[in-house]
Interface confidence: medium
């Protein structure tokens, strides 16, 4: 967890996360997009647990198959590459969670879709937000 | 561990060109807003340009703009700055510096610097 | 362009006395995301500035505590607790809201 000397910057870099998975929800569930339907076949792992930032360490193991489902999307969907989008958000997920940090993530039992996914780390970053305000 | 190293600074007369370098390693380069701003000898910091992590965006200090130029490549964990028509009031230790939050930021851009290089100097004198 | 005033310009003080610098911005640096955009740097002699404060009041990595940093809208405070002997050197805020990125003047701590 963040020193309380550091809330404002999590807090930001929360928000910069929040921004990029809106981005990647707004992008794929895009009416124009012809590849949601084979996109909403990809299974993901859901965390059973997400309240704190060492959580999001289920995030970043799931980044590779979210960025293998966006390479089928049409990139004009996008500001960024689905390479670029990933490492960017990656990077935030490291700095957010600690790079040093040894969590072992413990997935649901069910799996979920993308938008599904999405949502659920989108709730989480707002509700971390909410308590960091 | 983070570091930035500048490089490119010299002596140069008046009018002429100079591009800086500034390798960054300990990092992903490529995810954070760059900067440069120098100090004139015995004067405070003044801010010269910002680029953002992917290049969409780049703004310069009112007494660069239209003479200096900020870039970056990412492939190459390097930000420069071109800078041409020199003048004697360029004189200066121009650093190079990383952005303190990663990511976009688009709507709230935080214009926040974590780690500074250790300086290159530029003099412009006939 | 946001116009940043410090002041005292030069500050002695004595070891493990309190110290403090202040800093006025011509605009509001609060964001509607309800930070302040301000940052607050020290540069000792002959090194690069280091980040003490972001956003106001957020100590930067590795900033003792005797440090701290308050304020909001356009009247900023640096406040050091109990000064040390390595805390000499010029300290700078800039605002980090909107480009053109402008800092104040600086403000000189020197033991007395």
């Known amino acids: 967890a963040p020193t309380s000397s550091s809330t404002k910057k999590t807090q930001l870099q929360l928000e910069h996360l929040l921004l990029d998975l809106q981005m990647i929800l707004n992008g794929i569930n895009n009416y124009k997009n012809p590849k949601l339907t084979r996109m909403l076949t990809f299974k993901f792992y859901m965390p059973k647990k997400a309240t704190e930032l060492k959580h999001l360490q289920c995030l970043e193991e799931e980044l590779k198959p979210l960025e293998e489902v966006l390479n089928l999307a049409q990139s004009k969907n996008f500001h960024l590459r689905p390479r670029d989008l990933i490492s960017n958000i990656n990077v935030i997920v490291l700095e957010l969670k600690g790079s040093e940090t040894t969590f072992m993530c413990e997935y649901a039992d069910e799996t979920a879709t993308i938008v599904e996914f999405l949502n659920r780390w989108i709730t989480f970053c707002q509700s971390i937000i909410s308590t960091l305000t | 561990q983070v570091q930035l190293v500048e490089s490119g600074g010299g002596v140069v007369q008046p009018g002429r060109s100079l591009r800086l370098s500034c390798a960054a390693s300990?990092?992903?380069?490529?995810?954070?807003?760059m900067y440069w701003v120098r100090q004139a000898p015995g004067k405070g910091l003044e801010w010269v340009a910002v680029i953002w992590y992917d290049g969409s965006n780049k703004y310069h200090g009112d007494s660069v703009k239209g003479r200096f130029t900020i870039s970056r490549d990412n492939s190459k964990n390097t930000l420069y700055l071109q800078m041409n028509s020199l003048r004697a009031e360029d004189t200066a230790v121009y650093y190079c510096?990383?952005?303190?939050?990663?990511?976009?930021?688009?709507?709230?851009?935080?214009?926040?610097?974590?780690?500074w290089g250790q300086g290159t100097t530029v003099t412009v004198s006939s | 362009d946001i116009v940043m005033t410090q002041s005292p310009l030069s500050l002695p003080v004595t070891p493990g006395e309190p110290a403090s610098i202040s800093c006025r911005s011509s605009q509001s640096l609060l964001h509607s995301n309800g930070f302040n955009y301000l940052d607050w740097f020290l540069q000792k002699p002959g090194q690069s500035p280091q980040p003490l404060i972001y956003?106001?009041?957020d100590r930067a990595s590795g900033v003792p505590d005797r440090f701290s940093g308050s304020g909001s809208g356009t009247d900023f405070t640096l406040k050091i607790s109990r000064v040390e002997a390595e805390d000499v050197g010029v300290y700078y805020c800039m605002q980090a809201l909107q480009t053109p990125l402008t800092f104040g003047g600086g403000t000189k701590v020197e033991i007395k």
């Open positions: 956003l106001g009041s």
């Open positions: 300990g990092f992903t380069f490529s995810s954070y807003g």
């Open positions: 510096a990383k952005g303190a939050v990663a990511g976009t930021g688009r709507d709230y851009y935080y214009y926040g610097m974590d780690v």
